[in-house]
Interface confidence: medium
């Protein structure tokens, strides 16, 4: 009988009477920026070092009574969730606490910045093993706080933050909106998003994943043997910080990009009821609940990919949206999506020496999203091959012509506002899997990659009758790198990857006749790396 | 943490100094920007993070902070440097009147300035 939250993050092979997964994150140091803590609590005694760092604003109200147990409440609980003896995730992790929140749980952006700087200086003075920084706090969007998080992440530190408890788009808050930070939303025992009074967990494209965050039992600062149940995205973030500590302890050389990809890969998929989120946020919000990997080693052979959504382009005619991968990731494909269906496609382009995915709005469109498929592909050499609009009626096509390069994704982009609603679909000739085919008035972009042992194949699923959604998934052992719709289906709203499934969305079927125009084909490019598989076998 | 506006023992009312010139005026065409929290109740006007360009050294940060104090003093404003950042971002934290923002944005090396704001336990 273990608390529901520890059971939820534990893969079945660990589940015994007690939650005791192998190695408790002992090689990792977790920094906690929060309230003061009760370091002599039975749960965390000897596990948490209270640093002398303190930068907090005065408490509000002249009659505020500073009571130690109240001041320590939030931080003590979170320290317990990360590394508590009985109710912690990473029981072996050591922690250091910095006080940046006052007795009312309030701090400042400047105080948090100075705290992050303190961590960086400590890291330089005394380099230790992997560092995880837990930021169980949120304020309004802050350019400077996000920038500081980016710098610290680029110094090799893993930052985990609360998505926020405002039942709102996490991109409006910091540090939740910082792309380099792992941003965590909260779910409950029923895998539903957490409601907190009239508000609840934040959501949207800036959330990386969800974790248990309701009725989480942990150390209470009322006494050294007391426990309390608390709820919030802080608690969810603490779970992920604990999982990260476990993963880094098992594989100390993991980069932030590798860690994030593993967190996503080992999460429970599609268990959250998306109806809780506002309709326009459902497609953007990851349906992932964090879990520990089933074994601490041996994940290296897999080709890991994740989907990154851009911010909304806005409705102006020439508006564009850009989705970017993390520095250590490869952009293997690029797609776009518009709720109105009015878009001018997408293209992969170089920006600052790195490929980005840019989507284009169309006249009368409400705006577009760019969707990047970002993958971990060591020693990869990727390039984009472009074919301009063709004159021929067969449509535009482009393939990977370099020796050893394989097709990982197809994009198409057109200058005209409307690709001609009444033109029949152009079907890709069979037996030519290594090429992208598009509408004759579109330019087509093929993402071609060379990497040791990389092999890819194309998988299609076509539905003759109109459907709001067509999907095609990659089989076990293969990873989805590219997702697009076959050209000619002008009512397609766009295509995007959800885990290992390619989703092509169309306009409401009631507005579309059941002619050949209704036909929708989803095209998935599925890849695997034999090189990574061999490397991991050699390690074992 | 500093007291309310009463605690000004470190506030500088500097005389005009050689620092207070325009020798290092910002490069032509690059304008520093000002940012503040979109959620009004969370704003903390009167405290600002002045972020300097990426490659700015600590000595330049300190010089820029002193220059701001000197120029502000010439206009009759008290300012207080609360912290000089280095290690993550170059810059400094300053307690000053919002009236001085225009002046501060014109200082050399300044990338952007952000008004301080509140963060909350989640």
């Amino acid at each position: 009988s273990i608390p529901w939250n520890l059971e939820r993050i534990t893969p079945p092979r660990y589940r015994a009477d007690e939650y005791q997964p192998p190695d408790g994150g002992s090689l990792v140091e977790v920094y906690l920026l929060d309230t003061s803590i009760q370091s002599d609590h039975r749960e965390i005694e000897g596990r948490v070092m209270v640093t002398d760092f303190e930068n907090v604003p005065e408490e509000d109200g002249t009659r505020f009574h500073r009571q130690a147990s109240k001041c320590d409440s939030h931080g003590t609980h979170l320290a317990g969730v990360v590394s508590g003896r009985d109710a912690g995730v990473a029981k072996g992790a050591s922690m250091r606490s910095l006080r940046v929140l006052n007795c009312q749980g309030k701090g400042t952006v400047s105080g948090t910045l100075i705290g992050l700087e303190f961590i960086r200086k400590s890291q330089l003075v005394q380099p230790v093993g992997p560092l995880v920084v837990l930021l169980p706090l949120a304020g309004g969007y802050s350019r400077v706080l996000n920038a500081a998080c980016q710098r610290l992440a680029r110094a090799g530190v893993v930052l985990v933050t609360a998505a926020g408890n405002f039942r709102d788009d996490a991109c409006l808050y910091s540090p939740a909106s910082a792309p380099e930070v792992i941003t965590v939303g909260a779910t409950n025992a029923q895998d539903q998003p957490v409601t907190l009074g009239t508000l609840g967990t934040n959501f949207g494209r800036c959330v990386d994943l969800f974790a248990p965050g309701e009725d989480i039992i942990g150390a209470s600062s009322d006494c050294s043997t007391c426990f309390v149940s608390q709820s919030g995205t802080s608690q969810a973030a603490a779970h992920v910080a604990g999982i990260a500590a476990m993963m880094l302890s098992a594989e100390p050389e993991l980069t932030l990009a590798e860690l994030r990809q593993r967190l996503i890969h080992f999460s429970a998929k599609d268990v959250i009821n998306e109806a809780w989120f506002p309709e326009d946020q459902r497609v953007l919000t990851p349906n992932l609940v964090a879990a520990l990997p089933p074994s601490t080693h041996g994940a290296g052979w897999q080709l890991f990919c994740r989907t990154v959504w851009s911010a909304h382009s806005g409705p102006t005619r020439m508006a564009t949206a850009v989705a970017r991968c993390a520095p250590d990731e490869e952009l293997l494909s690029c797609s776009s999506f518009s709720r109105s269906g009015k878009r001018r496609g997408e293209r992969m382009e170089a920006q600052g020496g790195k490929l980005v995915c840019r989507a284009h709005n169309a006249f009368g469109g409400e705006g577009v999203y760019a969707i990047a498929r970002c993958c971990l592909l060591p020693q990869a050499n990727c390039s984009v091959h472009t074919a301009p609009p063709a004159e021929a009626s067969m449509g535009t096509r482009v393939h990977c012509h370099q020796q050893g390069h394989v097709l990982t994704g197809c994009s198409s982009h057109w200058e005209v506002e409307d690709l001609g609603t009444h033109k029949p679909p152009v079907l890709r000739p069979r037996g030519q899997p290594n090429q992208c085919v598009g509408h004759r008035e579109a330019s087509i972009h093929a993402s071609c990659c060379h990497a040791p042992g990389l092999e890819c194949k194309v998988k299609e699923h076509g539905i003759p009758a109109p459907q709001e959604q067509v999907t095609v998934a990659c089989e076990e052992g293969w990873t989805l790198t590219g997702c697009s719709a076959l050209p000619g289906t002008s009512h397609v709203l766009g295509a995007y990857a959800v885990d290992n499934t390619c989703v092509v969305r169309s306009r409401d079927v009631s507005t579309t006749g059941s002619t050949s125009e209704g036909a929708v084909t989803a095209v998935a490019i599925c890849c695997r790396s034999r090189h990574l598989a061999q490397a991991s076998q050699e390690l074992q | 943490q500093e007291d309310e506006d009463g605690d000004y023992e470190e506030l500088v009312l500097a005389l005009r100094s050689e620092e207070d010139g325009l020798a290092e005026a910002p490069e032509h065409g690059t304008t520093a920007t000002f940012h503040r929290c979109a959620k009004d109740p969370w704003r903390l006007p009167g405290t600002y993070v002045v972020v300097l360009k990426e490659e700015t050294h600590l000595s330049q940060s300190e010089r820029t902070a002193r220059r701001l104090q000197a120029q502000a003093a010439r206009r009759g404003y008290l300012t207080k440097i609360l912290h000089v950042f280095h290690g993550l971002l170059p810059g400094f934290l300053v307690k000053m009147s919002g009236d001085l923002l225009e002046l501060a944005l014109k200082l050399p090396h300044v990338d952007y300035i952000e008004e301080d704001s509140s963060v909350f336990a989640q």
Partner: antibody, heavy 131, light 106 residues
Amino acid sequence: QVQLVQSGAEVKKPGSSVKVSCKASGGTFNSHAISWVRQAPGQGLEWMGGINPILGIANYAQKFQGRVTITADESTSTAYMELSSLRSEDTAVYYCARHYEIQIGRYGMNVYYLMYRFASWGQGTLVTVSS
Amino acid sequence: DIQMTQSPSSLSASVGDRVTITCRASQGIRSALNWYQQKPGKAPKLLIYDGSTLQSGVPSRFSGSGSGTDFTLTISSLQPEDFAVYYCQQFDGDPTFGQGTKVEIK
């Protein structure tokens, strides 16, 4: 209000073991919130151990470590305390006591506390150890 | 372990008297202290928790105070049914009880 009803008196030989039960009735039984406290004749109260109110992991007083085992059976709403290697000084009344739960609200997000505050007690079980 | 020392170990008082029992912890325990009343042949009964909060159903003549290491139980006007043994119990560490204070009729 939960009533705790304990098993009857026992007479045991030194070196043997005793297992005392504590059944909850009326209200919801929380097997994770039971401690055992003993009282030797004419003496004070002594906490022996309890089921950790959070994880269901037993927590024992240093003095009894290795000799006492506390378990709980959710299906029958019964908690058990087994004391081994009995000696004459173990002659005492053994009480089961339920930890108290209170509703609170701080940061608008806390739900309840569980702690070693013994709000309801069993009637006691006299265990006599004699050769 | 945290030691709890009660004083006095016994006291004689009359109905209507104000009675004070003190309890000292061997180290600071915040407000993590409870007071119990026990009558002969019966199980203890919770009177005060968290140092000063009256358990529901307990007469208001009972009150508790103190925090850190020194705590007090006060009976403002002793009633016939109050003659019993009183125990303090800390729960900041593993629970430990004081040795008890016996309140007898003078």
